[in-house]
């Protein structure tokens, strides 16, 4: 199963890009296109990303791009860089020579025998850098998405394939499945690979059946598997939770709408800093767990769970994973409490002293004898116990 | 302009080893990437190899890799092809190419040709 993420990602921030880049395969990807499939050709040398040349891009490495990237083959040749020299020659001899010249550390080229990627490799310095770029749209437009799960790191898979997003059926669908998913998404690894109806069901096509990853691969549509089958209906859409998903819950207060504030992150729960634990972060909060508004935020107490969550919100966020946050850096909120809050719909605003039991509450254990809690809310958040 | 000479070619029994050489007139011969392109018997041109301005890049044929290397000396001018274990199938022209903008893989990017040096390889 999945590990933990390494050392070098546990200090994070809602400002850094994604854990995993696009293009395992081939280190490459597209970038400033109408799509995910689309675009100017970037290929990545050692921890940057650089574009390609397009004095030397043809249409094998047009096409084996556009393979690698799932995005089926590519379009017109009319989408690639003119054939033409890239720069005319230098001046005549005599002149100083420009060898030692900055453009001599010019643009890297992706090369290729044939339209596949395993054909093609990325040569440094192919070609000085006179800013043209190469360029390619694909034929077919891929992707990847999580719906309904409070967030982009959690929910029902769905994929687009030919114009149309669609589910995936749940039948042996796990936790290798679910990684692939969480980690083409950037959204780390998988917590849960969940079965159908922990999410709303889907409207549209099942795109795929009987998914079977090794947990290598780049691409969920690079996995083996089956086109979806009449057989499986929306009750059995695939799932999946992964551990750059953030759900809350208020613990230790009179209901589930009072109490210490703890995020679920990375596969475990975490405190809040209430260094800047302000109205607005407490007001989104109350909102997003069906809470109605923050109604005072009482005073908390030490930290007791292993990481530690700072949010900063301007008050109008759905949720507190939209405001800019920042998990576990050396100097979070080091002389803070874990911050608490009462929100105005807990009964001990009503002098009640009955706890609410939360509506509609199922309890199931999936994988590894992990408990799973759901709460049928309107955010349809997933409280993992 | 830029004249390239190769030189090196003949024949050669399958297994044996040949060395190109192709020399410029150009003073900046530094400036230039070079590479090798051939044309086989009733065959179209095809790219050998080739490398960058100052010889840290390298690229080459599938059909070559492993078995010949590029190299450059730019204080004299040459370009080089170590060409080890030959077949029959490697019989062809071999013309030496240069170019300013990018390393000489595609033809449309080729500024100068040489003349060319023929290797037959005997099986």
């Known amino acids: 199963h999945p590990s933990p993420a390494p050392p070098d990602q546990l200090n994070t921030s809602s400002a850094e890009s994604e854990l995993w880049e696009p293009g395992e395969r081939l280190p490459v990807r597209l970038t400033n296109g109408s799509s995910s499939c689309s675009g100017t050709v970037e290929v990545r040398l050692e921890a940057s990303w650089e574009p390609a040349c397009g004095a030397l891009w043809d249409s094998r490495a047009a096409e084996a791009v556009c393979r690698a990237l799932g995005c089926g083959g590519a379009e017109a040749a009319s989408q690639l860089a003119p054939p033409t020299p890239e720069l005319p020659p230098p001046p005549a001899a005599g002149n100083t020579s420009v060898a030692a010249n900055a453009t001599l550390a010019g643009a890297p080229a992706l090369l290729c025998s044939g339209a596949e990627w395993r054909l093609c490799e990325v040569v440094e310095h192919a070609c000085r850098s006179d800013g043209r770029r190469a360029r390619v749209t694909c034929a077919e437009n891929r992707a990847l998405r999580l719906v309904d799960g409070g967030g982009a790191c959690a929910g029902r898979v769905e994929m687009l394939e030919h114009g149309e997003w669609g589910s995936v059926c749940d039948d042996t669908w796990d936790l290798e499945d679910a990684h692939v998913v969480c980690r083409q998404l950037g959204c780390g690894w998988a917590v849960q690979a969940l079965p159908g109806l922990h999410f709303t069901p889907g409207r549209g096509p099942i795109h795929r059946d009987q998914v079977n990853c090794s947990g290598a691969e780049a691409y969920l549509w690079d996995c083996p598997g089956l086109p979806g089958q009449h057989y499986c209906g929306h009750k059995e859409d695939a799932g999946a939770v992964c551990s750059e998903h953030q759900s809350w819950r208020l613990t230790g207060g009179a209901d589930r709408c009072e109490g210490q504030v703890e995020v679920h992150f990375r596969g475990v729960w975490n405190t809040v800093c209430d260094s800047e634990w302000y109205p607005s972060e407490a007001k989104v909060l109350c909102q997003s767990l069906g809470c109605g508004t923050a109604v005072e935020r009482p005073k908390g107490l030490p930290h007791s769970l292993s990481g530690r969550m700072y949010y900063s919100c301007n008050g109008e966020e759905l949720t507190l994973s939209n405001c800019s946050w920042r998990f576990n850096n050396s100097n979070l909120c080091s002389q803070s409490l874990a911050a608490r809050v009462l929100c105005s719909a807990s009964r001990s605003l009503h002098n009640l002293s009955t706890p609410e039991v939360p509506a509609s509450v199922q309890t199931v254990t999936i994988e590894s004898s992990v408990t799973v809690k759901i709460e049928n809310k309107e955010s349809r958040e997933l409280m993992l116990l | 302009q830029v004249q390239l000479q190769e030189s090196g070619g003949g024949l050669v029994q399958a297994g044996g080893s040949l060395r190109l050489s192709c020399t410029a007139s150009?003073?900046?011969?530094?400036?230039?990437?070079l590479g090798w392109f051939r044309q086989g018997p009733g065959k179209e041109r095809e790219f050998v190899a080739a490398?960058?301005?100052?010889?840290?890049?390298?690229y080459y044929a599938d059909s070559v890799k492993g078995r010949f290397t590029i190299s450059r000396d730019n204080a004299k001018n040459t370009l080089l092809l170590q060409m080890n274990s030959l077949k029959p199938e490697d019989t062809a022209v071999y013309f030496c190419?240069?170019?300013?903008?990018?390393?000489?893989?595609?033809?449309?990017?080729?500024?100068?040709w040489g003349k060319g040096t023929q290797v037959t390889v005997s099986s």
């Open positions: 490398i960058n301005w100052v010889g840290g890049s390298t």
């Open positions: 190419v240069a170019s300013w903008g990018a390393m000489p893989v595609l033809t449309h990017v080729i500024n100068y």
């Open positions: 150009e003073r900046t011969f530094s400036d230039y990437a």
